[in-house]
């Protein structure tokens, strides 16, 4: 069904990092255009990118309502010039997407170390504390106001001179770690939500070592 | 667990009007879309109306359009079904059901039963 | 308004045959169409929705199928509380519609 020379949209899919989250469809119009329209399971349908040429749709500002909730996205496909016409059934042609739930399946970004520095033998690493665009009275949230306590951090470092690596975590931004005296060492971490069955971990984060290690212990 | 239980039902003559509840537990229900679904004695089922979480989006099927209308009241967890100018035809079973994006229906009342009859 | 037709309208099995009912559409409705079971005097319960998506709680000897006019609904084998009666329903657009049913007995 549907009208002439409009054809559904197909391969609805998801694209979100840290609540950014973008729907992203095909095939590229020809002599169509598209509108979006995003709900949770209240049925109550928002219309978003009304009548674009575009082949994708940010939806943050949508979903960061409440990103526990699961939303259902729907893609509608109307003739180019002629956006009152419908189907054969008096009705535009659509496509839902999958579901989606965004604290189940944004991917994490990669993380950030902010920061090493040494007390005595110890480092502490310090992981940049990522500001989402999930506000709350009025203010943005950060990943771990968002998270909370699922979110766990990786530490992985190792002597520059052996490839032995070691493995530290967290759920907070900070570790403090054993280090030998005199030696250097790299660090790269890693985001992990052990509550979610997949899609649980970040990209590794750009890994950072320390230089000239002697004068940062003082000698 | 899911529970959702009609009233309201019973025996009413041709022209008459009756007041279905649906009271909601065991999830947050201004979540959800709700709906009606009917099943006349010894028929199939038969989508009746539909309602989206805020209450702002309804739909009816053309038998029933300007004679009942569905509503809710989320601070009561509560669906109703008015139906005015009743017939014949609409002694059925009425079942409320919750009803994710307004689709599919996951779960169901136990229905109750209207009769319409002189 | 879409036309949703069963086949069979009833069928007779034995416990553990593999069982087929389809339903079709008068025109396309993608995936959107779901499946109940309903027992006699009893409220129908989800067993299907988007077609293949089984319903949280049903067991996996059921199974849905199809996309577009034709879908079919598999019990992978049959087990005496499966003998009720099963409806198909689009959800593509309203009024949204149902299948008359196919009554499954036992054979």
């Known amino acids: 069904s549907g009208t002439t020379n409009t054809v559904a949209a197909y391969n609805l899919t998801w694209k979100s990092t840290n609540f950014k989250t973008i729907l992203e469809w095909e095939p590229k119009p020809v002599n169509q255009v598209y509108t979006v329209q995003i709900s949770t399971k209240s049925g109550d349908w928002k219309s978003k990118c009304f009548y674009t040429t575009d082949t994708e749709c940010d939806l943050t500002d949508e979903i960061v309502k409440d990103v526990k909730q699961t939303y259902l996205a729907r893609v509608f496909s109307y003739p180019a010039g002629n956006v009152e016409s419908t189907g054969s059934a008096g009705e535009p042609l659509y496509e839902n997407s999958p579901e989606f739930t965004p604290y189940l399946e944004t991917n994490l970004g990669q993380p950030t170390i902010q920061s090493f520095e040494q007390v005595g033998t110890k480092v502490n690493v310090t992981v940049e504390d990522e500001r989402t665009l999930v506000r709350r009275n009025n203010t943005f949230l950060s990943l771990r106001d968002v998270f909370g306590k699922d979110l766990i951090y990786t530490l992985y470092y190792w002597k520059s001179s052996s490839s032995g690596k070691k493995t530290a975590k967290t759920n907070t931004n900070e570790f403090l770690i054993d280090v030998d005296k005199g030696e250097n060492y790299c660090f790269s971490v890693q985001a992990v939500i052990f509550s979610r069955k997949t899609n649980h971990k970040s990209p590794e984060s750009i890994t950072k070592c320390t230089e000239q290690w002697k004068s940062v212990l003082g000698e | 667990e899911v529970q959702l239980l009609e009233s309201g039902g019973g025996l009413v003559q041709p022209g008459g009007s009756l007041r279905l509840s649906c009271a909601a537990s065991?999830?947050?229900?201004?979540?959800?879309?709700m709906s009606w679904v009917r099943q006349a004695p010894g028929k199939g089922l038969e989508w009746v109306s539909s309602?989206?979480?805020?209450?702002?989006?309804?739909y009816y099927t053309d038998s029933v359009k300007g004679r009942f209308t569905i509503s809710r009241d989320n601070s009561k967890n509560t669906l109703y079904l008015q139906m005015n100018s009743l017939r014949a035809e609409d002694t059925a079973v009425y079942y409320c059901?919750?009803?994710?994006?307004?689709?599919?229906?996951?779960?169901w009342g136990q229905g109750t039963l209207v009769t319409v009859s002189s | 308004d879409i036309q949703m037709t069963q086949s069979p309208p009833s069928l007779s099995a034995s416990a553990g045959d593999r069982v087929t009912i389809t339903c079709r559409a008068s025109q396309g409705i993608s995936s959107r169409l779901a499946w109940y079971q309903q027992k006699p005097e009893k409220a129908p319960k989800s067993l299907i929705y988007?077609?293949?998506s089984l319903q949280s709680g049903v067991p996996s000897r059921f199974s849905g199928s199809g996309s577009g006019t034709d879908f079919t609904l598999t019990i992978s084998s049959l087990q005496p509380e499966d003998f009720a009666t099963y409806y198909c329903q689009q959800y593509n657009s309203y009024p949204y519609t149902f299948g008359q049913g196919t009554k499954l007995e036992i054979k």
């Open positions: 059901a919750r009803s994710p994006w307004g689709y599919y229906l996951d779960s």
């Open positions: 309602i989206s979480g805020s209450g702002d989006y309804t």
């Open positions: 065991g999830f947050t229900f201004s979540n959800y879309a």
């Open positions: 988007a077609a293949s």
